[in-house]
């Protein structure tokens, strides 16, 4: 269920869940928001100061990197 994640616990979870995609500590500008002036929401606010579940955590994964053929 939802839990608070701070410090190393948060980095561990992001690394495991996001894997090759990597992750952001702040959602990219405009991510999930229609207003350019909306304050950025950070993962620390969402997952450390409040509890967050796995799906919330996944929102901070970076987009897929288009890997080129070797």
């Amino acid at each position: 269920g939802p839990e608070t994640l701070c410090g190393a616990e948060l980095v561990d979870a992001l690394q495991f869940v996001c894997g090759d995609r990597g992750f952001y500590f702040n959602k990219p500008t405009g991510y999930g928001s229609s207003s350019r002036r909306a304050p950025q929401t950070g993962i620390v606010d969402e997952c450390c100061f409040r509890s967050c579940d796995l799906r919330r955590l996944e929102m901070y994964c970076a987009p897929l990197k288009p890997a080129k053929s070797a």
């Epitope: 994640l5 090759d20 995609r21 897929l64 288009p66």
Partner: antibody, heavy 118, light 106 residues
């Protein structure tokens, strides 16, 4: 050198419980998140469970949620998997694993066999 | 979950010949990772990041591909390469492996 040694496997009847252990050495155990991966003859390799370095965060594959509990004792450099309400489909070799970023599932123990059979 | 499908399930190749294993993901992934498992041993990381060789892996192994289709190639099969090979995706949670490809000597 990273060493992971699993124990606690065996033959158990459906519905019963078993606790697996994994003794870690050769690295700073408390700095690494850990996972269990299992290998059943019919299902190949399956990630089972994850626990963060401090033990405060855990994730499970859907088929074991509510039945399995991953935990760790950083003072003993040991990882655990408590398996309750075991089913025939849980029969597998269970591996303790860890990884570095990009080197996913880079380190494995030798595995311990769990057989669920009546 | 992303489903990983390897082909073929098994292949027999003559010593010194090329062996090619394919892995297809049900959705696009950033990279593919490959593991080698010899009888009675745990899997061993072989190739990471689609094409990078893990430490100590001979250069007869190579990886390529992008999107949903990836390939592991053994350019000149040696006796010690007899094993089961697995692909892994780590672009989407949860991590998922292919079903494995058994490589034997013809």
């Amino acid at each position: 050198e990273v060493q992971l040694v699993e124990s606690g496997g065996g033959v158990v009847q459906p519905g019963r419980s078993l606790r697996l252990s994994c003794a870690a050495s050769g690295f700073t155990f408390s700095n690494y998140y850990m996972t269990w991966v299992r290998q059943a003859p019919t299902k190949g390799l399956e990630w089972v469970a994850y626990i963060s370095s401090g033990g405060g965060s855990t994730y499970y594959r859907d088929s074991v949620k509510g039945r399995f509990t991953i935990s760790r004792d950083n003072s003993k450099n040991t990882l655990y998997l408590q398996m309750n309400s075991l089913r025939a489909e849980d029969t597998a070799v269970y591996y303790c694993t860890t990884e570095d970023y990009g080197y996913w599932f880079a380190y494995w123990g030798q595995g311990t066999l769990v057989t669920v059979s009546s | 979950d992303i489903v990983m499908t390897q082909s073929p399930d098994s292949l027999a190749v003559s010593l010194g010949e090329r062996a090619t294993i394919n892995c297809r993901a049900s959705s696009s992934v950033s990279y593919m990772h490959w593991y080698q498992q010899k009888p009675g041993q745990p899997p061993k990381l072989l190739i990471y990041g689609t094409s990078k060789l893990a430490s100590g892996v001979p250069d007869r192994f190579s990886g390529s591909g992008s999107g949903t289709d990836f390939t592991l190639t053994i350019s000149s099969l040696q006796a010690e390469d007899v094993a089961v090979y697995y692909c892994l995706q780590r672009s989407s949670y949860p991590p998922t492996f292919g079903q494995g490809t058994k490589v034997e000597i013809k």
